[in-house]
């Protein structure tokens, strides 16, 4: 449970009524859209001996609900209908027979905003705690995914990029990951909270955007992070090149990495010819690849693709299902809006591709 979602507990004390009746719950909780929160809650109500054999049922209702007419948003009573819009998302996680009325909310939605009250029933003992009530505030999703690039991106060398949302919660609907990149890519493994993209960069992929988009379908909210690829040709010992960018979009180079140009016109001409050949082959192969799905279980090929707006063509790879519930959170993360990994070619100029073709790889 992300700690920031559990606000400092503003406990409302025992009711000012009778020491026999009380409910303790924080009066206000804030949760970001698409995320989840567990609200601790305890209550007490005197149970007469004559109700001892009856099961204890707990209910959370929206403020203003009429018990006899309106369904609760959550209950532990199996045959009780609950509000359609909260079904499966609001759960009475606490055990009312142990005086626990804790409420779990997952895939928080804007319309969850409002106040809620708890009700307990045990045989003929039935009581609605109209005070204190729980006020739920659903705010914008400000968290964004982290993208981990281990080491340096080199042309022709495959690297595993990890997009993670370690701040998301286990209990919610697993998010849908979408990757958007011009570079040749394929999908790697995913967990509940992360997705791996296998990228094999080409020289011309330097400076292009790579976007990881994460959609929380349970709440219909999306968040993304975009980085700029730095494809570095390093013949010597490779060094990690991950730098936060300033968002200006300017290409940066690391001082002391660019070495002298390769001498000789003949060598230059030969190199230019080789580069042209390689570029043509790669481009043709890329077009073919764009017609065949790289992803697994291509079940939603018509789903709309992600930005950037300048993309000419997009390629969707169908969602991959996961039943895993363990989220691996990468330790190296990229925090800025736009990132650059330093791109330096030893003795060559990367050709500019004016009609970059972006490929979107979507996982679920």
């Amino acid at each position: 449970m992300p700690l920031l979602l559990l606000l400092p507990l503003l406990w409302a004390g025992a009711l000012a009524m009778d020491p026999n009746f009380w409910l303790q719950v924080q009066e206000s909780v804030t949760v970001q859209e698409g995320l989840c929160v567990l609200v601790p809650c305890t209550f007490f109500h005197p149970i007469p001996y004559y109700d001892k054999n009856s099961p204890v049922h707990g209910y959370w209702f929206r403020e203003g609900a009429i018990i006899s007419r309106d369904s609760p948003v959550a209950t532990n009573k199996l045959d009780q209908e609950v509000q359609e819009e909260t079904q499966g998302r609001f759960r009475l996680l606490g055990d009312p027979s142990r005086n626990n009325c804790s409420l779990s909310i997952v895939d928080a939605r804007r319309r969850d905003n409002g106040s809620y009250f708890f009700r307990m029933e045990r045989g003929s003992t039935k009581y609605s705690y109209k005070s204190p009530q729980l006020s739920v505030h659903v705010t914008d999703l400000t968290h964004r995914p982290k993208i981990l690039i281990p080491g340096t991106l080199e042309p022709g060398h495959s690297k595993n990029l990890t997009c993670s949302v370690s701040w998301a919660c286990e209990q919610g609907t697993p998010p849908i990951f979408s990757w958007l990149s011009a570079a040749p890519t394929s999908l790697g493994p995913r967990t509940t909270h992360s997705s791996v993209l296998i990228i094999t960069p080409r020289p011309q992929d330097h400076g292009t955007n790579l976007t990881c988009q994460v959609k929380f379908a349970g709440a219909g909210v999306t968040t993304e992070r975009t980085i700029q690829l730095n494809v570095t040709y390093v013949p010597q010992n490779p060094t990690t090149g991950i730098f936060p960018g300033d968002g200006s979009g300017k290409q940066e180079t690391r001082a002391g990495v660019v070495h002298g140009a390769i001498g000789g016109a003949g060598v230059t001409a030969l190199l230019a010819l080789c580069l042209c050949l390689i570029f043509f082959i790669v481009k043709t192969h890329r077009r073919k690849a764009a017609r065949t799905a790289v992803g697994r279980n291509d079940t939603h090929p018509t789903t709309g693709s992600a930005s950037p707006k300048h993309q000419k063509k997009s390629k969707l790879h169908g969602p991959t299902e996961t039943s895993s519930c363990s989220g691996a959170a990468p330790t190296v993360e990229m925090d800025e809006e736009l990132h650059y990994a330093s791109l330096n070619f030893h003795g060559m100029n990367p050709s500019k591709d004016t009609s970059t073709e972006y490929s979107e790889v979507r996982t679920q």
Partner: antibody, heavy 127, light 107 residues
Framework: QVQLVQSGAEVKKPGASVRVSCKAS????????VHWVRQAPGQGLEWMGI????????TYAQRLQGRVTMTRDLSTSTVYMELSSLTSEDTAVYFC????????????????????WGQGTLVTVSS | DIRMTQSPPSLSASVGDRVTIPCQAS??????LNWYQQKPGKAPQLLIY???NLEIGVPSRFSGSGSGTDFTLTISSLQPEDIATYYC?????????FGGGTKVEIK
């Protein structure tokens, strides 16, 4: 001081309905359950049912199920008992009683007592 | 339903006498028993709760005892103001049930 004041005597014809009120004062209305008990002339006490102060479906004695309805009005701290399809067997004094629950055992179960009663309402069913 | 039986339905005693009023439950009620006193034309009043606990304001000549299914209300020294009908009531289970009552009169 705690008081339960009931409505006045009623005379009804068989098949009719009667509604008896019980107005509470001197305590926090929403903290106590209210029961209804009746007593036919020269007979013992018969429990009719219980209503929660915060609403929801009351619990009724099985033999009265379908004929008795208990409601409450928070704004006036009043509990009502309505009995329909009256017969001569329903001629009785009807009492409302406040239930107090005393500190209980380690399981949280509590003793139950009727610590305050209304003065009673005589309902006579006669053709 | 738990049946509560009070026998005899009435008894006569002299002022100052020790009076015992029995009550029997049809099953074990775990001491979950109250005693009420009802005077003619009045509502019942709580005397004893939980088998043996004296309600506040009730004279100490009243006491209760028993366990399981057999219970007794005792008036150690009968007074004229004790003329009333006495009811036992169980709260072990719903429906709550009362005994038929025992009417106490002065000889």
């Amino acid at each position: 001081q705690v008081q339960l004041v009931q409505s006045g005597a009623e005379v009804k014809k068989p098949g009719a309905s009667v509604r008896v009120s019980c107005k509470a004062s001197g305590y926090i209305f929403t903290n106590y359950y209210v029961h209804w008990v009746r007593q036919a002339p020269g007979q013992g006490l018969e429990w009719m049912g219980i209503i929660s102060p915060s609403g929801g479906s009351p619990t009724y004695a099985q033999r009265l199920q379908g004929r008795v309805t208990m409601t409450r009005d928070l704004s006036t701290s009043t509990v009502y008992m309505e009995l329909s399809s009256l017969t001569s067997e329903d001629t009785a004094v009807y009492f409302c009683a406040r239930e107090s629950r005393l500190r209980g055992n380690r399981l949280g179960l509590q003793s139950s007592i009727f610590d305050h009663w209304g003065q009673g309402t005589l309902v006579t069913v006669s053709s | 339903d738990i049946r509560m039986t009070q026998s005899p339905p009435s008894l006569s005693a002299s002022v100052g006498d020790r009076v015992t009023i029995p009550c029997q439950a049809s099953q074990d009620i775990n001491n979950h028993l109250n005693w009420y006193q009802q005077k003619p034309g009045k509502a019942p009043q709580l005397l004893i709760y939980d088998t043996s606990n004296l309600e506040i304001g009730v004279p100490s000549r009243f006491s209760g005892s028993g366990s399981g299914t057999d219970f007794t209300l005792t008036i150690s020294s009968l007074q004229p103001e004790d003329i009333a009908t006495y009811y036992c009531q169980q709260y072990e289970n719903l429906p709550l049930t009362f005994g038929g009552g025992t009417k106490v009169e002065i000889k």
